[in-house]
């Protein structure tokens, strides 16, 4: 297993950075388990690797503050979370504590997302050693690569368009720094 | 789906012991903390107890502590609660409940309950 | 223990006419990390508990957008936009920001 050792640009925020709350991507790493994967979001909560672009990784990841962001499987509705150990699973709920991640941005393009909570990295579950500690090992880096582009305007019609949604549910201006960590019985 | 059912419960004298049971299926049980709530019938909710996902922190409420243990065999997705030194106030429908993340204090599915009766 | 205080104690409802019931936490429920921990369930007569809202105003999976949580710091509100025949029960609000969680009495929602 190769350790890359790359150096996080600080306060990397992607609301900035690309200009929106919500992205749809794939999150895609070279490095986690020596083979090429998606990252995804099953069904029954589980999270894995796919060797190609799946329905099911297909993620949505919406800004929650600067640097900070939540995943949301696409298909299955789960957010991505992350147990005190470092270990993935995928919640119909969401809780800050285990479901925000920090999105650290590497100057070749490739993401590092860690826990905020914990400051755990992010890991796709490694196939080589089940019982490993996800915890020990360094960050995997992942690649963004853009998801399904949004449906096509519909033709002009009879009925006049709407106007623009400009509304929005992101809680980014509820949300202020997180100094502390979030309430829960300490493990 | 997540699905959650208790057993272990009945009529008991004061002072007894019972120890309740409760089986998930429908999601990763190891992945989340479990609590127990209970109700006197027509009365309103009561928090009783919770374990963390790897039944490293537990809490309890002033009202059972030193009386009710709460455990969990993350093998067999099986939650207990063991209560001794029963009184008539604990006289209640013991609900279990999935926990919203693996530490978090928010209960999101809750079982059917089982029935405690402590009477003389 | 954090004290929850809901009004009003009974709620007679018109189908189709909005509803909303209030919250009060004996002390802020606002964290550090900018989210309420204010929770609301719906207890459907003779069913165990169903999680509505939580965080103080995000739904719960599967439940209809009629329903709606607001609120920050001590004072929470759940609005029905529209009520049904099947919203019927006792709705309760819990705290989840410390130990012990604490649940406010219940309000009884009928139909008129």
């Known amino acids: 297993h190769h350790h890359h050792h790359h150096h996080p640009i600080p306060d990397s925020s992607p609301l900035l950075q690309f200009g929106g709350q919500v992205r749809q991507r794939y999150l895609y790493t070279d490095d986690a388990q020596q083979t090429e994967a998606h990252l995804e979001i099953r069904e029954d909560g589980t999270v894995g690797g796919a060797a190609h672009e799946s329905p099911e990784s297909l993620l949505e990841l919406k800004a929650l503050k600067p640097g900070v962001i939540e995943i949301l499987g696409v298909k299955t509705s789960r957010f991505l979370c992350q147990k005190p150990d470092g270990a993935l699973y995928g919640s119909l709920h969401f809780d800050p504590e285990a479901c925000s991640f920090r999105e650290l941005l590497l100057e070749n393009g490739y993401n590092v997302y860690e826990s905020e909570a914990h400051g755990l990295p992010l890991h796709l579950p490694g196939n080589k050693s089940p019982h490993r500690d996800p915890a020990s090992e360094g960050p995997a880096r992942f690649l963004p690569l853009p998801g399904l582009p949004p449906a096509p305007p519909e033709p002009p019609g009879i009925l006049a368009p709407e106007p623009p949604d400009v509304g929005s549910s992101d809680p980014l201006s509820m949300v202020g720094p997180s100094e502390a960590r979030s309430p829960s019985y300490a493990s | 789906e997540v699905h959650l059912v208790e057993s272990g419960g009945g009529l008991v004298q004061p002072g007894r012991s019972l120890r309740l049971s409760c089986v998930a299926s429908?999601?990763?049980?190891?992945?989340?903390?479990m609590h127990w709530v209970r109700q006197v019938p027509g009365k309103g909710l009561e928090w009783v107890s919770v374990?963390?996902?790897?039944?490293?922190?537990?809490g309890y409420a002033d009202s059972v502590k030193g009386r009710f243990t709460i455990s969990r065999d993350n093998a067999k997705n099986s939650l207990f609660l063991q209560v001794s030194s029963l009184r008539a106030e604990d006289t209640a429908l013991y609900y279990c409940?999935?926990?919203?993340?693996?530490?978090?204090?928010?209960?999101?599915?809750w079982g059917q309950g089982t029935l405690v009766t402590v009477s003389s | 223990d954090i004290v929850m205080t809901q009004s009003p104690l009974s709620l007679p409802v018109t189908p189709g006419e909005p509803a909303s019931i209030s919250c009060r936490s004996s002390?802020?429920?606002?964290?550090?990390?900018?989210?309420?921990?204010l929770d609301w369930y719906l207890q459907k007569p003779g069913q165990s508990p169903q999680l509505l809202i939580y965080?103080?105003?995000t739904r719960a999976s599967g439940v209809p957008d009629r329903f709606s949580g607001s609120g920050s710091g001590t004072d929470f509100t759940l609005k029905i936009s529209r009520v049904e025949a099947e919203d019927v029960g006792v709705y309760y609000c819990?705290?989840?920001?410390?130990?012990?969680?604490?649940f406010g009495g219940g309000t009884k929602v009928e139909i008129k």
């Open positions: 409940a999935k926990g919203i993340s693996p530490t978090g204090t928010t209960p999101d599915y």
């Open positions: 429908g999601f990763t049980f190891d992945d989340y903390a």
């Open positions: 374990i963390t996902w790897n039944s490293g922190s537990i």
């Open positions: 002390q802020s429920l606002l964290h550090s990390n900018g989210y309420n921990y």
């Open positions: 965080l103080g105003s």
């Open positions: 819990m705290q989840a920001l410390q130990t012990p969680p604490t």
